[in-house]
């Protein structure tokens, strides 16, 4: 099966790599614009130069193209705790990331929020914090894992999943309560 090509892809595939078909004259192949530039005017004829102009401040193109406008630079989302790793240039978009000892949680494909890595208090680090994943903690005896924090078994209620992990402690508490003096 042949994959469905959009009109632009169909037109481009007629020309050799690095060129595109003239929108008004399909017998002419124009040279694409370099990254950091955009198409101002199509080439007037075969072998003649395409009129490409440099992107203005606040915009970019990251690959060769025949776009009529440069793309707007992304802005890091402060409300998501994002910080700017590198600023936008004419040929590269802004790179956003998180601070040290933070990880990214992706709410959607292109939107992430920064969260502090768990410190595993009352436990040990099973897997270190990574760019896109929080620390994985293992809790000490007498503690259970709740929302990636080690919580004392004294906070374990019978209905919670912690009962298996905290069973010895719960039994001990019961035992001390039940053992009366004769």
């Amino acid at each position: 099966l042949v994959p469905h090509l959009g009109d632009r892809e169909k037109r481009d595939s007629v020309c050799p790599q690095g060129k595109y078909i003239h929108p008004q004259n399909n017998s002419i192949c124009c040279t694409k614009c370099h990254k950091g530039t955009y198409l101002y005017n199509d080439c007037p004829g075969p072998g003649q130069d395409t009129d490409c102009r440099e992107c203005e401040s606040g915009s970019f193109t990251a690959s060769e193209n025949h776009l009529r406008h440069c793309l707007s630079c992304s802005k890091c989302r402060k409300e998501m705790g994002q910080v700017e790793i590198s600023s936008c240039t004419v040929d590269r978009d802004t790179v956003c990331g998180c601070r040290k000892n933070q990880y990214r949680h992706y709410w959607s494909e292109n939107l992430f929020q920064c969260f502090n890595c768990s410190l595993c208090l009352n436990g040990t680090v099973h897997l270190s914090c990574q760019e896109k994943q929080n620390t994985v903690c293992t809790c000490h005896a007498g503690f259970f894992l709740r929302e990636n924090e080690c919580v004392s078994c004294s906070n374990c209620k019978k209905s919670l999943e912690c009962t298996k992990l905290c069973l010895p402690q719960i039994e001990n508490v019961k035992g001390t309560e039940d053992s009366g003096t004769t």
Epitope: W107, S108, N110, L111, E147, N148
Partner: nanobody, 117 residues
Framework: EVQLLESGGGLVQPGGSLRLSCAAS????????MSWVRQAPGKGLEWVSA????????YYADSVKGRFTISRDNSKNTLYLQMNSLRAEDTAVYYC??????????WGQGTLVTVSS
């Protein structure tokens, strides 16, 4: 078939509280980010809050931060929104949505919250 059914809306006085619930079915609830989105009368949609599959990560819009709390119970396939210190500007239809950020693929039918004295 994915179904999201909100409940818990109603009329409340300013400063009051409400707890919204969303019963989910037809997909593996515990594997997805979930959100609350609202639409005030005559306004656009506002992403209010989101929670990660584990519940470890949460997001709140500035307009509700410190007043609203999102939570989930994966054993019951239910999403919650505890709304405290309600204001007139919180009046809206509240929708439960599968996904978050710029990617909501399913919505509930909504529940109306009216804050008025």
């Amino acid at each position: 078939e994915v179904q999201l059914l909100e409940s818990g809306g109603g009329l409340v006085q300013p400063g009051g509280s409400l707890r919204l619930s969303c019963a989910a079915s037809g997909f593996t609830f515990s594997a997805y980010n979930m959100s609350w989105v609202r639409q005030a009368p005559g306004k656009g949609l506002e992403w209010v809050s989101a929670i990660s599959p584990s519940g470890n990560e949460t997001y709140y819009a500035d307009s509700v931060k410190g007043r609203f709390t999102i939570s989930r119970d994966n054993s019951k396939n239910t999403l919650y929104l505890q709304m405290n210190s309600l204001r007139a500007e919180d009046t809206a239809v509240y929708y439960c949505a599968k996904g978050a950020g710029e990617a909501f693929d399913y919505w509930g039918q909504g529940t109306l919250v009216t804050v008025s004295s």
